[in-house]
Interface confidence: medium
């Protein structure tokens, strides 16, 4: 691949002929350093840049604003890419978002959004979404009208309460809202009746904590 055209995302990686899922290095506009990401080349045509993954509870997601800003974890396992990187990537071109979910009974479901981007740090990494489809509920468990990102040390929700403190993790909380994929990881048998778990309300209800989640983005024109 020509040096002047580095990979902006996993779609570029895929289109360059790399169609195996795994870790790749991408060069995001306006970011000083390259970034290692997990590319999912299997789901729905491939080319997906994974921005969040939960699978085993090995990583602590109860972190502050700075850590959610710059990201944490490892793309080979559980991780959060970082809001600054998600903002920078989704500023490059138009993206869609796909969220893959699995419950403790082995049922899989997904939610997909035709448009996804977030604001910058000054805008509290506000969520912008359009066009929800998928099998994880008829309604969107992400706030379609948008919500600011909150963490335990940055309360930007609409609750008159501190959602991120009470539900744990950093997320686009409303009041507090029907989802939190960065909540506490609970193992099988312990995952019912948990308000602060990994929640996608319109898939499994308000207090069921999920087994695994993957959030991934891909350009609209892929």
């Amino acid at each position: 691949r020509e040096e002047e055209k580095p990979f902006r995302d996993c779609a570029d990686v895929y289109q360059a002929g790399f169609n195996k899922s795994g870790i790749y290095t991408i060069y995001i506009n306006n970011m000083p350093e390259p970034k290692k990401v997990f590319c999912n080349m299997d789901v729905n045509g491939g080319g997906w840049t994974v921005i969040q993954h939960r699978e085993d509870g090995s990583l602590d997601f109860q972190r502050g604003w700075k850590e959610y800003k710059m990201g944490f974890g490892n793309p080979s396992g559980e991780y959060w890419l970082g809001n600054e990187f998600i903002f920078a990537i989704t500023s490059q071109r138009q993206y869609m978002l796909r969220i893959e979910l699995m419950d403790w009974e082995g049922n899989r479901a997904y939610s997909q959004y035709d448009r996804f981007h977030i604001g910058n740090e000054k805008q509290n990494y506000r969520l912008y979404l359009k066009g929800h489809t998928g099998t994880a509920g008829k309604q969107s468990s992400l706030i379609l009208h948008g919500a600011d990102f909150s963490t335990k040390d940055a309360d930007n929700d609409n609750c008159m309460c501190k959602c991120a403190l009470m539900l744990t993790g950093g997320w686009w909380f409303d009041a507090c809202g029907p989802s939190n994929l960065n909540g506490m990881f609970y193992t099988a048998g312990q995952n019912h009746g948990k308000l602060n778990g990994i929640k996608w309300h319109y898939f499994k209800g308000p207090s069921y904590s999920l087994r695994s989640t993957t959030m991934m983005i891909r350009p609209l024109d892929f």
């Epitope: 009208h145 609409n158 008159m160 309460c161 009470m166 507090c176 009746g193 308000l195 309300h201 308000p206």
Partner: antibody, heavy 120, light 111 residues
Framework: QVQLVQSGAEVKKPGSSVKVSCKAS????????ISWVRQAPGQGLEWMGR????????NYAQKFQGRVTITADESTSTAYMELSSLRSEDTAVYYC?????????????WGQGTLVTVSS | NFMLTQPHSVSESPGKTVIIPCTRS????????VQWYQKRPGSAPSIVIY?????PSGVPDRFSGSIDSSSNSASLTISGLKTEDEADYYC?????????FGGGTKLTVLG
């Protein structure tokens, strides 16, 4: 299906206090916010405040701050709204209400209402 | 805090369509979900629209909700009006300072 049953009508003197109860059944009481809303004769709906029983956290509308206290007893799945320093303008039907989606600030389920009359 | 403004009353004949607007005074109407409640005399309010346009089960599809960012307002549309639709209708939204209701609109079904 959540059901909310409120205590009966009250007649109170100006300056006194009233405490209205709201017993919930058929849902997870502790994890759902219980709001209190009132409607004075000929007036619209007015939100007074709410409590999240599992957290014991109550929030109040600015208008009622200092005069209203909302509490909850998880053991009996009952929420309470106490309004003090009553005046004639507080004559209203008082409703408790909750959402099927915990904490969200909209109201799917309502109690039958409690008429509070403030009169000397 | 913001205010939600509704017309005091609207009236229409059975079978017709009526639109009840609800205008937000400050902040974007799209920044928080809007709900609509029906309130009949002597009864508790009941939700007819939530999350801008979602209809709870049991509410007829004659009821629909929408948001218009250009006028910073939400609307409740009731088509195929029936006499039993006669009631007060309230819009409601919220922000980090609490819950706000509109002043209510009295819907009269003529005839």
């Amino acid at each position: 299906q959540v059901q909310l049953v409120q205590s009966g009508a009250e007649v109170k003197k100006p300056g006194s206090s009233v405490k209205v109860s709201c017993k919930a059944s058929g849902g997870t009481f502790s994890s759902h916010a219980i709001s209190w809303v009132r409607q004075a004769p000929g007036q619209g709906l007015e939100w007074m405040g709410r409590i999240i029983p599992i957290l014991g956290i109550a929030n109040y509308a600015q208008k009622f701050q200092g005069r209203v206290t909302i509490t909850a007893d998880e053991s009996t799945s009952t929420a309470y709204m106490e309004l003090s320093s009553l005046r004639s303008e507080d004559t209203a039907v008082y409703y408790c209400a909750t959402s099927r989606l915990e904490w969200l600030l909209y109201l799917d389920y309502w109690g039958q209402g409690t008429l509070v009359t403030v009169s000397s | 805090n913001f205010m939600l403004t509704q017309p005091h009353s609207v009236s229409e004949s059975p079978g017709k369509t009526v639109i009840i607007p609800c205008t937000r005074s400050s902040g974007s109407i799209a920044s928080n979900y809007v709900q609509w409640y029906q309130k009949r005399p002597g009864s508790a309010p009941s939700i007819v629209i939530y999350e801008d346009k979602q209809r709870p089960s049991g509410v007829p599809d004659r009821f629909s909700g929408s948001i218009d960012s250009s006028s910073n307002s939400a609307s409740l549309t009731i088509s195929g009006l029936k006499t039993e639709d006669e009631a007060d209708y309230y819009c409601q939204s919220y922000n980090s300072r609490g819950v706000m209701f509109g002043g209510g609109t009295k819907l009269t079904v003529l005839g």
